[in-house]
């Protein structure tokens, strides 16, 4: 057998047992399950004299443990008196001693019920950035009683004089109260409260629990963007997992491959949310070829706090093919904004869904940050359309006058864009449309002047442009003028913006 | 072949306690998440509960207190502990394993085991 | 909680007939619906994941369709071994609700 140490226990009488007139008593000390021998006991008798007697040590039977009894007897005024059994066993190390202090004979008591209490979380079930924690020590038969709380096992340096003890009838009750911080709460460890009381332990632990339902945790896999797939020809996918709850448990996230052959090596990025939720992003490069070609990727996801793993996959979006139109407009000037200007562009018509929209200036691609784009919606037909839209300062257009907006989509020939060129004072610059056939029913216009046009804020148009009704299926006001450019020899007409 | 066999089933009185055990072979039970479905006489199927391959465990709100999943993957056996029984248990439990890859529905099932309660 | 409501209870058809089972989420189901066949005294067996992915084995007569609440099951061509219970079941999550599983539709003999 292996080296084991001894569990030890005190042994005393009911003091309702031991004559008020005794003048001495006897009390003991088990030491038991301990291998090898032997265990050395000694005893602390205070100020009185007392005589010990150690039996031999006997062997359990199923273990082959040793177990073995020593006897105090003390006289005199033993009833006050605590008494320390020492027992060392340095077979299990040198230093190895349980230390039992107890009275001769132990008292009728009701024991204490332990029960920790924890602290609401707010309005909207986040915690709080502390967490009190409350030990209810209930109903014991009043006493000396000592409060450890435990962090892991491990006793915490905790202020203990707020502890506050009450009597109701013969029962008494005390409270203590362990304050923590939101992190330390949320990293999963266990917080016991330990109650010593008549040489007996009582406890109870809290830990946070894990969601038993996950508040919603998501997860998404995105297709590439057109921009990656065409342009920069280096698609890539990701799947998003949101509102996971953080502990100690990892979110796993594996790729594969519906035709079974191999996946890239995928990028990873973990990101702690405000509201406390944890964010988790796994980015894989695909090959453009065989995205085109069909292959299905999926995304599966295991965590601790997820019923069950959860499975995303995705593939090139079937069915019918558009190609985008493409408007671009400038909207005039604003009082007070004479510095800046905003242009839109709506993009429309086009299946599928996916697309990508930038705007150039000098031939540069703007950074993304500097437009905004709205999520495709359905338009009243089959297809999808989008807004964009760009603020651009007077040093821009002083510099060049013309801002393209460009749609990077699959269906768009010969490659995959479409794009359409606007100025913040269509007057003095025009665009030019490329990639870009007429649409039907795009205007209705008589090749002459009809009146001053109404967005113009009074200026009169370049002569060569013409104002006419905006589309039938136009998503915005009927009486919408708009203006068309009569260009020689490239495309017939251009918008250039609201007149 | 994927087989998952229960037991355990059988007649037994209102407030009384059942055991289920769901044997799994043919497959590596640790990579999967295991359910319990149970479908009452000439009724639907429902859900019961769920455990996952971290051993946490998930009830259907009806079933919360009164049952308890577990797994021993090392005896390759997922348990079903059914306390304080009503005549409304009354049903066959299946025991059923959730695709390897998630979120797709029970890929096998094993044949059921009866629990009928009554005086 | 997400709640399933499969349609029609029942429905009675002959072979050949092409049969369209409905299921209703409460709430858009972003991926996992599933669709099961059961026979009296067996077990359900899987024939559709993840909205239309055909179960290994299960004939091509079979077909998952929809997105966001609305499913269905479609038999294109309905035989005599097609005659059981369907159910559908929201497959993503085991959410706290009081079923994850449709209420069955039987298809009988007309």
């Known amino acids: 057998a292996s080296t084991q140490s001894p569990s030890v226990f005190p042994l005393t009488r009911c003091c309702k047992n031991i004559p008020s007139n005794a003048t001495s008593v006897t009390l003991g000390c088990l030491a038991t399950g301990y291998f090898p021998e032997p265990v050395m006991v000694t005893w602390d008798t205070g100020s009185l004299n007392g005589t010990t007697m150690t039996l031999p040590a006997t062997t359990l039977t199923l273990s082959g443990h040793y177990a073995t009894i020593s006897l105090l007897t003390v006289s005199g005024a033993w009833a006050k008196q605590m008494f320390t059994c020492r027992v060392a066993h340095t077979p299990s190390s040198t230093d190895w001693v349980d230390n039992k202090t107890f009275s001769v004979c132990s008292r009728d008591f009701t024991p204490p019920t332990v029960k920790i209490l924890q602290s609401s979380c707010d309005g909207g079930g986040h915690f709080p950035p502390t967490i009190q924690l409350l030990c209810l020590v209930s109903g014991y038969t009043p006493g000396t009683i000592n409060i450890t709380w435990l962090e892991d096992g491990q006793v915490m340096d905790v202020d203990l004089s707020t502890a506050s003890t009450t009597q109701e009838g013969e029962l008494a009750s005390t409270q203590s109260e362990l304050t923590l911080s939101q992190k330390h709460w949320l990293s999963d460890r266990t917080y016991t409260c330990q109650v010593t009381y008549q040489g007996h332990t009582f406890e109870d632990s809290t830990k946070k629990c894990a969601d038993s339902n996950p508040r919603g945790v998501s997860a998404y896999l995105s297709r590439p963007s057109p921009f990656d797939l065409f342009i920069r020809k280096s698609p890539t996918i990701t799947c998003l997992v949101v509102d996971l709850a953080p502990s100690k448990g990892t979110v796993n996230l594996t790729w594969s491959r519906a035709s079974g052959k191999p996946v890239n090596h995928s990028t990873r990025k973990e990101e702690k949310q405000r509201n406390g939720t944890l964010t988790v992003t796994s980015t894989l490069p695909v090959g453009t070829r065989d995205w085109i070609e069909g292959e299905t990727y999926q995304c599966r996801v295991t965590h601790p706090h997820l019923p069950r793993a959860l499975m995303r996959s995705t593939t090139k979006t079937s069915g019918p093919r558009a190609a985008p139109e493409v408007y671009a407009f400038a909207t005039p000037e604003w009082p007070g904004s004479r510095d800046k200007r905003t242009l839109a562009c709506l993009i429309q018509n086009f299946m599928p869904e996916d697309i990508s929209v930038q705007w150039l200036h000098n031939e540069v691609q703007l950074p993304d940050a500097r437009h905004s784009t709205t999520q495709p919606r359905k338009t009243k037909g089959s297809g999808f359309f989008v807004f964009s839209r760009l603020e651009v300062t007077r040093a821009e257009w002083e510099q060049k006058d013309e801002f393209i907006c460009r749609a990077v989509h699959e269906a768009a020939s010969p490659s995959q864009t479409v794009q359409r060129a606007v100025s913040v004072n269509p007057g003095l610059a025009g665009g030019s449309a490329q990639s870009q056939r007429a649409p039907d029913r795009v205007l209705c216009h008589s090749g002459q002047q009809q009146g001053l046009p109404r967005a113009a804020g009074g200026s009169v148009p370049h002569p060569r442009c013409h104002c006419g009704a905006g589309r039938a299926d136009w998503p915005g006001p009927p009486e919408l003028d708009v203006c068309v450019e009569e260009a020689e020899g490239e495309a017939p007409w251009t918008w250039t913006g609201l007149c | 072949q994927v087989q998952l066999v229960e037991s355990g089933g059988g007649l037994v009185q209102p407030g009384g306690s059942l055991r289920l055990s769901c044997a799994a072979s043919?497959?590596?039970?640790?990579?999967?998440?295991m359910t319990w479905v149970r479908q009452a006489p000439g009724k639907g199927l429902e859900y019961v509960s769920i455990?996952?391959?971290?051993?946490?465990?998930w009830y259907a709100n009806w079933a919360s207190g009164r049952f308890t999943i577990s797994r021993d993957n090392s005896k390759n056996t997922v348990y079903l502990q059914i306390d304080s029984l009503r005549a409304e248990d009354t049903a066959t439990y299946y025991c059923?394993?959730?695709?390897?890859?998630?979120?797709?529905?029970?890929?096998?099932w094993g044949q059921g085991t009866l629990v009928t309660v009554s005086s | 909680d997400i709640q399933m409501t499969q349609s029609p209870s029942s429905v009675s058809a002959s072979v050949k007939d092409r049969v369209t089972i409905t299921c209703q989420a409460s709430?858009?189901?972003?991926?996992?619906l599933a669709w099961y066949q059961q026979k009296p005294g067996q077990p359900p067996k899987l024939l559709i994941y993840?909205?239309?992915t055909l179960a290994s084995g299960v004939p091509s007569r079979f077909s998952g369709s929809g997105s966001g609440t609305e499913y269905a099951l479609t038999i294109s061509s309905l035989q005599p071994e097609d005659f059981a219970t369907y159910y559908c079941?929201?497959?993503?999550?085991?959410?706290?609700?009081?079923?994850?599983f449709g209420g069955g539709t039987k298809v009988e003999i007309k």
């Open positions: 059923a394993r959730e695709t390897h890859h998630g979120s797709s529905g029970i890929d096998h």
């Open positions: 043919g497959f590596t039970l640790s990579n999967h998440d």
């Open positions: 455990i996952n391959t971290y051993g946490n465990h």
């Open positions: 709430e858009s189901i972003y991926s996992g």
């Open positions: 993840d909205h239309s």
């Open positions: 079941q929201h497959a993503d999550y085991a959410h706290h609700s009081d079923n994850v």
